[in-house]
Amino acid sequence: IIPVEEENPDFWNRQAAEALGAAKKLQPAQTAAKNLIIFLGDGMGVSTVTAARILKGQKKDKLGPETFLAMDRFPYVALSKTYSVDKHVPDSGATATAYLCGVKGNFQTIGLSAAARFNQCNTTRGNEVISVMNRAKKAGKSVGVVTTTRVQHASPAGAYAHTVNRNWYSDADVPASARQEGCQDIATQLISNMDIDVILGGGRKYMFPMGTPDPEYPDDYSQGGTRLDGKNLVQEWLAKHQGARYVWNRTELLQASLDPSVTHLMGLFEPGDMKYEIHRDSTLDPSLMEMTEAALLLLSRNPRGFFLFVEGGRIDHGHHESRAYRALTETIMFDDAIERAGQLTSEEDTLSLVTADHSHVFSFGGYPLRGSSIFGLAPGKARDRKAYTVLLYGNGPGYVLKDGARPDVTESESGSPEYRQQSAVPLDGETHAGEDVAVFARGPQAHLVHGVQEQTFIAHVMAFAACLEPYTACDLAPRAGTTD
């Protein structure tokens, strides 16, 4: 199945010459970025990117690795060191603080320097760090958050919240002692810390009082409002803006995104996280690509530009379950959103970054034949005379012993969307990994994204590119905001 043209050295020489020609034409833009987009693939380590690239190709009946993801087309790439101040291997809270605020923090804290301590409310005040999104808003730009998780989840919360515990989604999750000390839940901070123009994702239940039925699952008490303070945060948010609109399903979203009277849009499409792309009801819930498009339609109306955070948040969840099928199909939808955003924006005035907050203990190996299914088996057998998959996890729930031995696996089993790849160590949930992750960049000042950098560098590149604090004297032309 090897393409015959690939046996000829001319094929590779010609391909490389074309790539070299394109590289030679790259000119670092000396202009400021009017718009900033950061695409965050939660848990999207390099092994995930590679495997997703192959899957995307195989879904188009290609062999796989020769395919280009949308993110592969970005001309500048760096490596990001993801450790948090207190852990070699971080969580999504500490990493969000790094790439969105430009300061490293401690494990499971958000929007706080490392002087703050996990779960200790009294260490919050005075240790807040300000996100690039907040700085963009202060500079007159429109701002938005789009995610497939709940909008109060760790990664998006890094854009607007300051909390010593990433799990404080609603006030029901905050201990009474912390509430008395003045620590606010993340949902409250979502609507009160700053003015966010577009909020799209999951997380309805954290916005409504306990006992409020969910509009999609009205009979299911477990999906209804969770708030103990009796507040309807959606109502409070709507009251703040004349042109604010709240939607909870795909149809309403598509209508609102085209309505010129809508200036602020909140769309919460599930009580908690949104469903995996492979489980999504396409009439009720929008895809990440559709949410991204809707956000861009609204945000791009501002002549001063915008800041947009787009998260493929459930790549991480698929990996935690040791279900590579879920993680990789989420990665492909994330890449589709990147592609669509590229069609709706210009690299002349928009700096787009794609990165991950951390990796996972997810591996791809075993010398599989070119063109063989990414979910398939490695050639030959392991030392226990059993088959093994090319995708594996270092730890996680895929660890199973049957009669004291590792179970055999067939191609049909491993290709199932529900299959959990095997792991060396049994855990309820597979863990993050500590290796560096990629940062892809395109647009004004993208050339700054190079080498091996601290994860905090990402926030600083965005701030500098758009001449935001602390780089208002960035000396780039045209200066940010001159287009209005």
């Epitope: 995996y276 492979i278 489980h279 009439t283 379950e321 969307p417 529900e418």
Partner: antibody, heavy 123, light 106 residues
Framework: EVQLVESGGGLVQPGRSLRLSCTAS????????MSWFRQAPGKGLEWLAL??????????EYSASVKGRFTISRDNSKSIAYLQMNSLKTEDTAVYYC??????????????WGQGTLVTVSS | DTQMTQSPSSLSASVGDRVTITCKAS??????IAWYQQKPGKAPKLLIH???TLQPGVPSRFSGSGSGRDYTFTISSLQPEDIATYYC????????FGQGTKLEIK
């Protein structure tokens, strides 16, 4: 409102074939996994076959007890799931149920069931 | 394939009694277990999914717990209308039912 209605059951001789239909309404058919189960008289419930949704390429799975004899399929334009049963045996006598998965907590739990259709295999 | 061992196969209890049914999986099913109630001539009715989440409209006397391979279904105070056969179902890896527990009133 989600509704599943099975049809096609009846009396059939051993060795013959039968096709069961499950007509679905009240939801976006292509977005959901569909499955067939059966229950022999006085016995427990047994899963037979599953067909996944559009996003996963309508792939299929079968229990070892029916693999090779039974085939699950779907006609998305009509919102119908089928179970083609070949080489029927007397032990295939049962009430056959069609079900739809719901993705709660990311698991494919069976929240919706049809009323069942009785298949009797006898000479 | 994942096997489910349900016990007891039958049980007799009085109105108001606390009733417990257990299911043991042949491997870790990661909390992907559901409990169904079936009455004669009817389709199974979902009571609980993901180990402990009650379906809409199901009385709070029904509950579930467990993790790993071991799971429990409890009726805190048996009512006459609870007379039925109860099944556990694992849905972590395809689907497997337990053998069922026939519940009768003393």
């Amino acid at each position: 409102e989600v509704q599943l209605v099975e049809s096609g059951g009846g009396l059939v001789q051993p060795g013959r074939s039968l096709r069961l239909s499950c007509t679905a309404s009240g939801f976006t058919f292509t977005d959901y996994y569909m499955s067939w189960f059966r229950q022999a008289p006085g016995k427990g419930l047994e899963w037979l076959a599953l067909i996944r949704n559009k996003a996963t390429g309508y792939t299929t799975e079968y229990s070892a007890s029916v693999k090779g004899r039974f085939t699950i399929s779907r006609d998305n334009s009509k919102s119908i799931a089928y179970l083609q049963m070949n080489s029927l045996k007397t032990e295939d006598t049962a009430v056959y149920y069609c079900t739809r998965a719901s993705f709660y907590y990311d698991g494919k739990v069976l929240a919706y069931w049809g009323q069942g259709t009785l298949v009797t295999v006898s000479s | 394939d994942t096997q489910m061992t349900q016990s007891p196969s039958s049980l007799s209890a009085s109105v108001g009694d606390r009733v417990t049914i257990t299911c043991k999986a042949s491997q870790d099913i990661n909390k992907y277990i559901a409990w169904y109630q079936q009455k004669p001539g009817k389709a199974p009715k979902l009571l609980i999914h993901y180990t402990s989440t009650l379906q809409p409209g199901v009385p709070s006397r029904f509950s579930g717990s467990g993790s790993g391979r071991d799971y429990t279904f409890t009726i805190s105070s048996l009512q006459p209308e609870d007379i039925a056969t109860y099944y556990c179902l694992q849905y972590d890896n395809l689907y497997t039912f337990g053998q069922g527990t026939k519940l009768e009133i003393k």
